[in-house]
């Protein structure tokens, strides 16, 4: 796969993942009422990071925001923080990667600068994806713990026995947002890795040029970049196509040096 394709695909995958992270963060269904083995209620509860909602069988849905910071569980705060950090890093990653894209020409930016920017955006995407995956996993772990605690309470007699009035414990299970978050985090991570791989292909490799230059000249003369236009084919105006026959040409080939990773 060419550097441009790898970089472009990495960018697109990261972008999709990033959009998914935003969607997951905003979604209300992080946890949903467990309907299995529960009395059938005409009310369905679900909760997000920012508000909790109740949908009645009447069709009426009411959502209430968590208007307190201090009263919220520390774990929920931590998950919020991780998702926001993931989004912020993703935004920066996208901005950096736009300028780093090989198919986009910006002034006289050379490949080494683009390589650095590609690597930076790749790392940002990787961290963003990891933040999302950790955030979602922490929330899922919290749900599992609470679920089994609720189950234990339900079967230990706290739900009411004998002549006592029964109360129903609302148990929560994984909501759609968790799955969106896991997939989105994974995509962002994969996209970031692809950007990092593309970065290797953008990095100029001087030793490669010397070897090619030495054999092509046939003369025992020290290599000077651009000094043997006629015999080496390394003139400043020549294009990669002359060395890599049939190779694809990118828009900024005039500025870029050929490397052994260009057409992997």
């Amino acid at each position: 796969m060419s550097v441009t394709a790898c970089q472009g695909l990495g960018f697109v995958v990261s972008l999709i993942g990033f959009a998914g992270i935003i969607a997951a963060t905003c979604m209300d269904q992080w946890s949903t009422q467990d309907l299995y083995n529960n009395p059938v209620t005409a009310v369905f509860n679900y909760q997000g990071l920012w508000r909790s909602c109740v949908r009645e069988s009447s069709g009426f849905t009411e959502c209430r925001g968590y208007f307190t910071l201090l009263g919220l569980p520390a774990m929920l705060q931590a998950v919020r923080a991780l998702m926001i950090v993931g989004i912020v890093l993703g935004v920066i990653g996208i901005l950096v990667s736009i300028f780093a894209l090989k198919c986009i020409r910006i002034g006289s930016m050379d490949d080494s600068a683009k390589a650095k920017m590609t690597l930076t955006s790749g790392i940002l995407f990787i961290i963003s994806g990891i933040c999302a995956i950790i955030g979602v996993s922490v929330f899922a772990n919290m749900l599992v713990t609470n679920f089994w605690m609720s189950t234990a309470n339900m079967y230990s007699g706290m739900g009411g026995m004998g002549g006592m009035v029964q109360t129903v414990q609302t148990r929560y299970t994984f909501g759609a947002a968790l799955f969106v978050g896991w997939v989105a985090g994974g995509l962002t991570l994969i996209g970031g890795v692809m950007m990092c791989i593309a970065c290797r292909g953008l990095t100029p490799d001087d030793s490669n040029f010397k070897a090619v230059s030495y054999h092509a000249s046939g003369q025992n003369v020290a290599y000077r970049p651009g000094g043997f236009k006629a015999s080496t084919g390394f003139g400043s105006n020549t294009r990669n196509k002359k060395i890599y026959d049939g190779g694809a040409r990118t828009e900024d080939d005039e500025q870029s040096h050929p490397t052994k990773y260009d057409y992997v």
Epitope: T41, V43, N45, C53, S58, V168
Partner: antibody
């Protein structure tokens, strides 16, 4: 304004079936559940089941499962309740009602008296 | 099924006096998600369908006089008519709106003393 108009009174033989209709007007029929409730003479109210006219989804009281069928026709904004294998104890006024906030029943049909007699 | 038990079965109150009807459910009707109790109160006069008075245990339906009020939470609920009027003579029902199948209390007949 919301209106639910039910079909007329029926006299049925034991073992037969009855189908009561409930025509809705004044609101988006497919957006609200229609519930069916019955009341035997001098007795209390008994919930029979519901239908979501938009999806066709139903939920029945176990007591009537297998005997009651609730359907809806969106084109005519009409809900139907069919009760089969009628017995004398099924003699009652059958009401349709539209669901409201809190799953309560704010709008009711005028009621349909079904008499089961041999 | 959820059992709804109303008390008393019948009640005679003088005009202008306070009338109180109680309703007890066999399970809590409180939904923790929105802190609302899914209980409704209906008034039924002879030959008429029931009329919704109160939903969410304490929210008065529009058009219902403010002398009607609902209170309670969990399993114990109360319908109060602060000043009984002649037109309030009817049978009153409470209803579980939380669990399927929805169930009604047996009814309380309110009369004028």
């Amino acid at each position: 304004q919301v209106q639910l108009v039910q079909s007329g009174a029926e006299v049925k033989k034991p073992g037969s079936s009855v189908k009561v209709s409930c025509k809705a007007s004044g609101y988006a029929f497919s957006n609200y559940l229609i519930e069916w409730v019955r009341q035997a003479p001098g007795q209390g109210l008994e919930w029979m089941g519901l239908i979501n006219p938009g999806s066709g989804g139903t939920n029945y009281n176990e007591k009537f499962k297998g005997r009651v069928t609730i359907t809806a026709d969106e084109s005519t904004s009409t809900a139907y309740m069919e009760l089969s294998s009628l017995r004398s104890e099924d003699t009652a006024v059958y009401y349709c009602a539209r669901v409201y906030y809190g799953n309560s029943f704010a709008y009711w049909g005028q009621g349909t008296l079904v008499t089961v007699s041999s | 099924d959820i059992v709804m038990t109303q008390s008393p079965d019948s009640l005679a109150v003088s005009l202008g006096e306070r009338a109180t009807i109680n309703c007890k459910s066999s399970q809590s009707l409180l939904n923790s998600g929105n802190n609302k109790n899914y209980l409704a109160w209906y008034q039924q006069k002879p030959g008429q369908p029931p009329k919704l008075l109160i939903y969410w245990a304490s929210t008065r339906e529009s058009g219902v006089p403010d002398r009607f009020s609902g209170s309670g939470s969990g399993t114990d609920f109360t319908l109060t008519i602060s000043s009984l009027q002649a037109e309030d003579v009817a049978v009153y029902y409470c209803q579980n709106d939380y669990f399927y199948p929805f169930t009604f209390g047996q009814g309380t007949k309110l009369e004028i003393k």
